[in-house]
């Protein structure tokens, strides 16, 4: 009897949908695996007789519930199927946006770039998929614990009237208000402000 794959799960970030599993202990030799997806009531092969412990399902429709399954194989024997269901638009993790930061005197000028999507045109981003897409920005004075959050209305934001000659750190994430779903924070970007722009009279 061939044991089934273990710890079967979907790892999906920005619609890069990778079905992953672990190979069970099997004394007779090396196992191979077949992964399938349900399409119009028929299971279709996606990865056949692979020695890998993952299979890329990024070409699935972003909409709807998908049934995926994987089994282990050895010679003419095979395990039972292990099934999971997956809805990309609901289940995919929102990866960190890109961010460009520029210092202008005592201001930080930020521009945000929505995450790109696997198997899509360069310009079709997570912002196109989710109508309610917005950004959360978090910033703090470097070396302090107090963080401030803002929700920009656009793809850019300016933090004004900051302390001069002070390093501020900023990070951004995608947020979907209608789903109350937050994405992953970007890596902090830390920049030092320069002089106060106001000129004494």
């Amino acid at each position: 009897m061939v044991p089934p794959p273990e710890n079967v799960r979907m790892n999906s970030v920005n619609f890069k949908n990778i079905l992953q599993w672990e190979s069970p202990a099997f004394a007779k030799g090396n196992l191979t695996f077949t992964a399938q997806y349900l399409s119009y009531r028929i299971f279709q092969d996606k990865c056949m007789n692979t020695t890998l412990t993952e299979c890329d399902f990024s070409s699935l429709s972003k909409y709807g519930d998908h049934t995926l399954r994987v089994r282990a194989e050895f010679a003419d024997e095979h395990s039972d199927w292990v099934n999971i269901t997956f809805c990309p638009v609901d289940d995919t993790i929102i990866g960190p946006p890109g961010m460009q930061v520029e210092v202008l005197a005592d201001s930080l000028h930020m521009r945000f770039l929505a995450p790109k999507i696997e198997n899509e045109y360069e310009t079709w981003t997570m912002k196109n998929v989710y109508n309610s897409w917005t950004y959360n920005v978090q910033y703090w004075k470097n070396g302090t614990d107090e963080k401030f959050q803002i929700t920009p209305q656009y793809d850019f934001e300016v933090l004004r009237n900051l302390e001069p000659w002070t390093t501020y750190c900023v990070q951004v994430r995608g947020f979907l208000p209608d789903r109350n779903k937050a994405g992953e924070w970007s890596e902090p970007v830390c920049e030092q402000t320069t002089h106060d722009e106001t000129v004494p009279s």
Epitope: S61, K62, Y121, N128, N131
Partner: nanobody, 124 residues
């Protein structure tokens, strides 16, 4: 049942232009996303372009960027693909497709309705 109808294909010389049209027979073309795809002889289906109804944004494959333009005329319920500077490698059957959910642009899996296609041949 929605029926998409493409027209405007034909034989054109390299460097020439064509304008493809996509209309929905007896229906409005009121879908979140309309896309154009193509299939060259012996090749798989390839995304060419799409247009989003929500913001009017347009998106293109790298291979056609700067040469092809997608647009929609809501009064005529038609989506167009203007193809300029055509090359031999643009020879294919071109399909129009409509998405009910509008979540995707390039992947054929994200589209629900398809036309029968129109042949475009670029040859001297």
């Amino acid at each position: 049942e929605v029926q998409l109808v493409e027209s405007g294909g034909g034989l054109v010389q390299p460097g020439g232009s064509l304008r493809l049209s996509c209309a929905a027979s007896g229906n409005s073309l009121d879908y979140p996303t309309i896309g154009w795809f193509r299939q060259a002889p012996g090749k798989g289906l390839e995304g060419v372009s799409c247009i989003s109804a929500s913001d009017g944004s347009t998106h293109y494959a790298d291979s056609v960027k700067g040469r092809f333009t997608i647009s929609r005329d809501n009064s005529k319920n038609t989506v167009y693909l203007q193809m300029n500077s055509l090359r031999a490698e643009d020879t294919a059957v071109y399909y129009c497709a409509a998405s009910l959910h509008g979540l995707g642009c390039k992947s054929e899996a994200d589209y629900d309705y398809w036309g029968q296609g129109t042949q475009v041949t670029v040859s001297s």
